[in-house]
């Protein structure tokens, strides 16, 4: 059946031969209605990429550099299956490119000019492309030829395989720049030896190099890693201190109509039957005809790449920056240490309009980028399309797991002028019911629930975490008869109560009328039995404080809070009747942009923060008629975090533990991608 056929692209006679053997052996073990292999031969990997894009083939395995080519328009391919190395229990799909230095040296990443450098080889990923790509804009002009610019940047180098005649400085530490193991400083171990011997000041290698060359921890402790934020870390902290994370070898397919499920089905079956130590007659990860045919010989198996993971996310911001710099050779005109405009990520059109107004008032210091969901915004910040946004704690957790960092906290209770330097304890997550109902925390089953959105703190993580520990399963849509939890599956009973309008029904943004704190409260007012919100929601939307038609006549005393002990209390008593304390919303950014974002926001709030009294004739950053656009409307200021500058420290151990427990119920495709 053609639609069940995966057309594998081969790039040599030997690969074509192995592909045919792969095809024949898969035919013998798979049912006739299962996936099958067809082989397409092309002259190069780039030809394979074009063939897949043109629907003349379906799949090929590529190195990271080629995954980048495959992702570029007009190819638009995406990673679908990753080879893994190491054990099945601890599968490695990535390696980390690192800059290793001796502990007793005292320079940082931004002080490499004039140092001596050790590289694995010219044109190699960890040893050349990544470090030189990231340093590209610091190289002296003209930057072409690249080797000359690098020679003029470092005071001496060993770059195996470089032309020692044209660029003698690149071979200063290893005369002749030998391109094989005859050169003692060749490849990973050689580059590390170049540092160890004292020939060079820095070695550009992969994270495992130091462990492979120094078995003794005491010896390893003589070395450190240079981090991109101009700090240093120990060599075992490579996950938090690297130049780039590089995918090893990846199967790519079309982004649309790419047969990714079929490709996975095929490769999963293939590894079961012909993986490491599975079969004598055909081996997926070796070949008598040559090395690394179709797949790497060192691979141990395959892992399915999560569907939310596109090529940008898979390759990572640092890797793409490095390769793009090298390929395109363009650098910003402004010096790299100068803050460019900060690109704020706005959710849907309501936030975009407020962001645009902010942009005009900031005279362009703020630019705007839009996305339809919070997770899409986080992804845009990760890949550099946006820089920052303010997030509920539940999304601070996801953003943190995706490598972003908290920059400033929203403060709600501290009056100026101390606000900016005060760390607040957080707000209360509460369950609100109508005073006229007889509901308690213990009889919510079968009732109608209203949530701010899936994945948010007060509206989801806290109440559903508590519920999970009571019911021990994740079928929350069965516990409540119906509800509105924006971000739920559209056919779920937890979208039944949402107001839309269609096609925005149950979308986790302001186009859904029951989204957010105010939306969840409105859902309670109009349709629901219980709303999970912040403790300030009822006072902020009653007594005429919200002029919208649905809210203008509401009275605070018509609502009560549910306490965990089964009692109920007035909405004025959240301190004695809440579900949990929630961390304040916080602004997040990429690490490389964090200082810039902080400086700019502190400046912006001095102009447009809560000191502005007349918001009808002035732009106010923390005002949007109860809609919480960009920031919560009750924000008094954005406050410095001091030492709470990681998501774990910011959210606190207890909350992180609660959200981690809920991950077994996670519906977050982004979280799945970021933890791949």
């Amino acid at each position: 059946v053609p639609e069940k056929s995966v057309r594998w692209c081969a790039v040599s006679e030997h690969e074509a031969t192995k592909c045919q053997s792969f095809r024949d052996h898969m035919k013998s073990v798979l049912p006739s209605n299962g996936p099958s292999v067809a082989c397409v031969k092309k002259a190069s990997h780039l030809d394979c990429i074009r063939a897949i894009a043109a629907n003349e083939a379906d799949a090929v395995t590529l190195d990271a550099g080629l995954v980048y080519d495959a992702y570029l328009a007009p190819n638009n391919l995406k990673p679908v299956v990753a080879e893994f190395y190491g054990s099945k229990e601890d599968p490695q799909t990535f390696y980390y490119a690192v800059a290793v230095v001796k502990k007793d040296s005292d320079f940082q990443m931004n002080q490499l000019r004039g140092r001596k450098s050790c590289h694995t080889g010219l044109g190699r990923s960890a040893g050349w492309n990544i470090p030189i790509g990231l340093l590209y804009c610091d190289l002296p002009e003209p930057r072409k030829p690249l080797e000359k610019a690098v020679a003029n940047f470092f005071s001496g180098s060993c770059v195996p395989c470089a032309d020692g005649t044209d660029f003698p400085q690149l071979c200063q530490l290893c005369p002749g720049c030998g391109c094989s193991t005859l050169n003692q400083y060749f490849s990973y171990s050689g580059a590390f030896k170049c540092l160890k011997d004292g020939a060079g000041d820095v070695a550009f290698v992969k994270h495992s190099t130091i462990f492979e060359n120094l078995a003794n921890k005491a010896d390893r402790d003589q070395y450190e890693l240079l981090c991109l934020d101009n700090t240093r870390k120990s060599v075992d902290e490579y996950k938090d201190c690297h130049l780039a994370r590089v995918p090893s070898h990846t199967v790519v397919a079309r982004s649309v109509g790419g047969k990714e499920d079929l490709i996975w089905e095929l490769l999963n079956q293939a590894q079961e039957h012909f993986g490491k130590d599975k079969s004598k007659e055909f081996q997926l990860f070796s070949s008598p005809h040559g090395k690394d045919l179709l797949f790497k010989d060192s691979a141990h198996g395959f892992l399915k790449v999560p569907p939310r993971m596109d090529a940008k996310m898979y390759l990572g911001y640092e890797y793409i920056t490095a390769i793009r710099n090298l390929r395109e050779g363009t650098c910003p005109e402004a010096p790299t240490d100068e803050c460019k405009p900060v690109k704020w990520c706005a959710l849907s059109h309501h936030e975009r309009l407020k962001c645009d107004e902010w942009s005009v008032n900031s005279a362009g210091k703020i630019e705007c980028e839009s996305a339809e969901t919070t997770e899409d915004c986080i992804a845009k910040i990760m890949n550099g399309e946006a820089d920052a946004m303010s997030l509920d704690g539940g999304f601070v957790y996801i953003a943190g797991m995706c490598g972003l960092v908290p920059v400033l906290a929203e403060n709600y209770n501290t009056p100026n002028p101390n606000c900016e330097n005060t760390a607040e304890e957080g707000y209360f997550a509460v369950a609100v019911v109508k005073s006229s109902s007889d509901l308690t925390w213990d009889n919510l089953k079968g009732k109608k629930s209203c949530h701010t959105a899936v994945g948010r703190t007060a509206g989801w993580n806290i109440p559903m975490g508590l519920l999970y520990s009571k019911i021990n399963h994740c079928r929350f849509d069965e516990f409540f008869s119906e509800g509105c939890a924006p971000g739920s599956e559209k056919n779920s009973s937890l979208c039944k109560l949402c107001m839309g309008p269609s096609p925005n029904l149950c979308e986790p943004n302001n186009k859904e009328g029951y989204y957010g704190y105010t939306g969840a409260f409105r859902c309670l007012v109009e349709k629901g039995d219980v709303a999970f919100v912040k403790h300030q929601t009822v006072p902020q939307n009653t007594g005429g404080k919200n002029p919208d038609a649905w809210a203008k006549n509401l009275k605070e005393e018509d609502y009560e809070l549910l306490c965990l002990d089964g009692s109920r209390k007035s909405v004025q008593e959240p301190a004695n009747c809440h579900l949990a304390r929630a961390p304040n919303h916080a602004v997040v950014a990429r690490k490389d942009k964090a200082d810039c974002v902080q400086t700019l926001l502190l400046d912006q709030q001095r102009m447009f923060g809560s000191s502005v009294t007349d918001c009808s004739s002035n732009f106010c950053l923390f005002e949007s008629k109860t809609k919480d656009l960009l920031f919560r409307d009750d924000t008094v200021c954005l406050a410095k975090l001091h030492d709470r500058n990681t998501y774990e420290k910011y959210l606190g151990e207890e909350y992180v533990k609660a959200v981690t427990n809920l991950r077994k119920c996670s519906t977050s495709p982004l979280l799945e991608a970021c933890t791949f």
């Epitope: 309009l353 407020k354 008032n361 005279a363 732009f619 949007s624 656009l629």
Partner: nanobody, 117 residues
């Protein structure tokens, strides 16, 4: 509530000029920020230019150096002077008063600008 009415659009050749006006039925003097947006067929509405009460302006990269936004609080009017027009400037142009628009959709009818030879 202030109603905004856009005018001044039309058909113009590439390289030509147009001046759009946005007249408010009430006072715009207290409006913090006014802006012009445009929407081409099948595309999202995008910010073209904005101006604050104090006269701070911001332009989309694609129109910088060609378009100029101004406001006359006494006349309750916002203008967009468009020079060196290009075919890609073809769109319906809308004016907005942010203090009303971003929590509810208050958009006028817009004015069509077509740049074609």
């Amino acid at each position: 509530q202030v109603q905004l009415v856009e005018s001044g659009g039309g058909l113009v050749q590439p390289g030509g000029s147009l001046r759009l006006s946005c007249a408010a039925s009430g006072s715009i003097g207290s409006s913090a920020t006014m802006a012009w947006y445009r929407q081409a067929p099948g595309k999202q509405r995008e910010l073209v230019a904005g101006i604050t009460r104090g006269g701070t302006t911001k332009y989309a990269d694609s129109v910088k150096g060609r378009f100029t936004i101004s406001r006359d609080n006494a006349e309750n009017t916002v203008y967009l002077q468009m020079n060196s027009l290009k075919p890609e400037d073809t769109a319906v142009y809308y004016c907005t008063d942010y203090s009303r628009s971003y929590y509810e959709d208050h958009w006028g009818q817009g004015t069509q600008v077509t740049v074609s030879s």
